[in-house]
Interface confidence: low
């Protein structure tokens, strides 16, 4: 997918725009809001009826190099007695994010934007029953 | 992509840190298409902690459209289809990276921005945590 070159008058190119070679774009990877804090309820991954674990993937040629992925612990959901109820399903909730990929070609390096699908957590759903004809 | 010559003795240079500013190819490498979550999954309706999806649009950002989840209830839906207030629906939040046009309105100049999005909701027990 390409970043749309928006043609609205809103995007008339200002004089202050930096010159950019054709087919590329300038990207400042000093992150805006780098230090913002997530104020999610504590330990929801273990308190959920569809609990999940986290694993960290690390790649030095990716920015950011660390990406955290969630995996649902169960196929079913945890009921009030703390037992797995397989009449319900734990399912992953996913979100796309952008990363910058560094590629080495001989003694040169190039950078590529990449979309990564991150599993954020899990939720408990009623299963869809497929009737066999 | 756009190649950048590396320093002499390149095998060990530039491996640790990314430069502050890079030139990247306009094509975004990815097998996943950016889909409307309402079409890609009906979990938001079938969950015991269902949520609504709200469209957040910003032409100065890429992707310009992001969907935000809002839990429908304070409690969770029980087996009878009623809201059980002994359980809580809570949002699952995730920090994601997007591109912000910088300077504003420039077509090919961006800065990475971290934003916090609510992706969906999950049903939790209000368990106590002991503080030392």
């Amino acid at each position: 997918r390409k970043i749309p070159k928006v043609g609205h008058t809103f995007f008339q190119k200002p004089e202050s725009c930096p010159p950019v070679p054709g087919g590329s774009m300038k990207l400042d990877i000093g992150i805006i809001n780098e230090n913002q804090r997530v104020s999610m309820s504590r330990n929801i991954e273990s308190r959920s009826t569809s609990p999940w674990n986290y694993t960290v993937t690390w790649d030095p040629n990716r920015y950011p190099s660390e990406v955290v992925q969630a995996q649902c612990r169960n196929l079913g959901c945890i009921n009030a007695q703390g037992k797995e109820d397989i009449s319900m399903n734990s399912v992953p909730i996913q979100q796309e994010t952008l990363v910058v990929r560094r590629k080495h070609q001989g003694c040169s390096v190039s950078f590529q934007l990449e979309k990564v699908l991150v599993t954020v957590g899990c939720t408990c759903v009623t299963p869809v029953i497929h009737h066999v004809q | 992509g756009i190649t950048i010559p590396r320093n002499p003795g390149c095998p060990n240079s530039e491996d640790k840190n990314f430069p502050r500013t890079v030139m990247v190819n306009l094509n975004i490498h990815n097998r996943n298409t950016n889909t409307n979550p309402k079409r890609s999954s009906d979990y938001y309706n079938r969950s015991t902690s269902p949520w609504n999806l709200h469209r957040n649009e910003d032409p100065e950002r890429y992707p310009s459209v992001i969907w935000e989840a809002k839990c429908r209830h304070l409690g969770c839906i029980n087996a009878d289809g009623n809201v059980d207030y002994h359980m809580n629906s809570v949002p699952i939040q995730q920090e994601i990276l997007v591109l912000r046009r910088e300077p504003p309105h420039c077509p090919n100049s961006f800065r990475l921005e971290k934003i916090l999005v609510s992706v969906g909701c999950t049903c939790v027990t209000p368990i106590v945590h002991h503080v030392a």
Epitope: - | K70, L74, P91, H130
Partner: nanobody, 124 residues
């Protein structure tokens, strides 16, 4: 612990207005969601409106355009401005909040709390 205290209920004529308020007090660390539910005689408790920590709000379809929820974070208070009231709005209105709080050295990370309820009667 945490207490939710509602006020502002009463008798009002159809087409009239009321403003409910609900103040949360106690050893509160954070309030994730505050809002209002209502229960009419012989019916299930139902959502009226919720306001989230970021300020965005959700409303039941039956009250959209008539009711407005707002929140004063500095006072841990939520308000419900009810305009164009109808007889079917008659119910006990309960304040609700999902709150993280301390009690006796224990952090309760996310628990639903309820007020005692305030009666709203819409009748001529």
């Amino acid at each position: 612990d945490v207490q939710l205290v509602e006020s502002g209920g009463g008798l009002v004529q159809p087409g009239g207005s009321l403003r409910l308020s609900c103040a949360a007090s106690g050893t509160i660390v954070n309030i994730h969601v505050m809002g209002w539910y209502r229960q009419a005689p012989g019916k299930q408790r139902e959502l009226v409106a919720l306001i989230f920590s970021g300020g965005s709000a959700d409303y039941a379809d039956s009250v959209k355009g008539r009711f407005t929820i707002s929140r004063d974070n500095s006072k841990n208070t939520v308000y419900l401005q009810m305009n164009s009231l109808r007889p079917e709005d008659t119910a006990v209105y309960y304040c609700a909040a999902e709150i993280g709080y301390y009690s006796g050295g224990t952090y309760y990370s996310s628990e639903a709390h309820w007020g005692q309820g305030t009666l709203v009667t819409v009748s001529s």
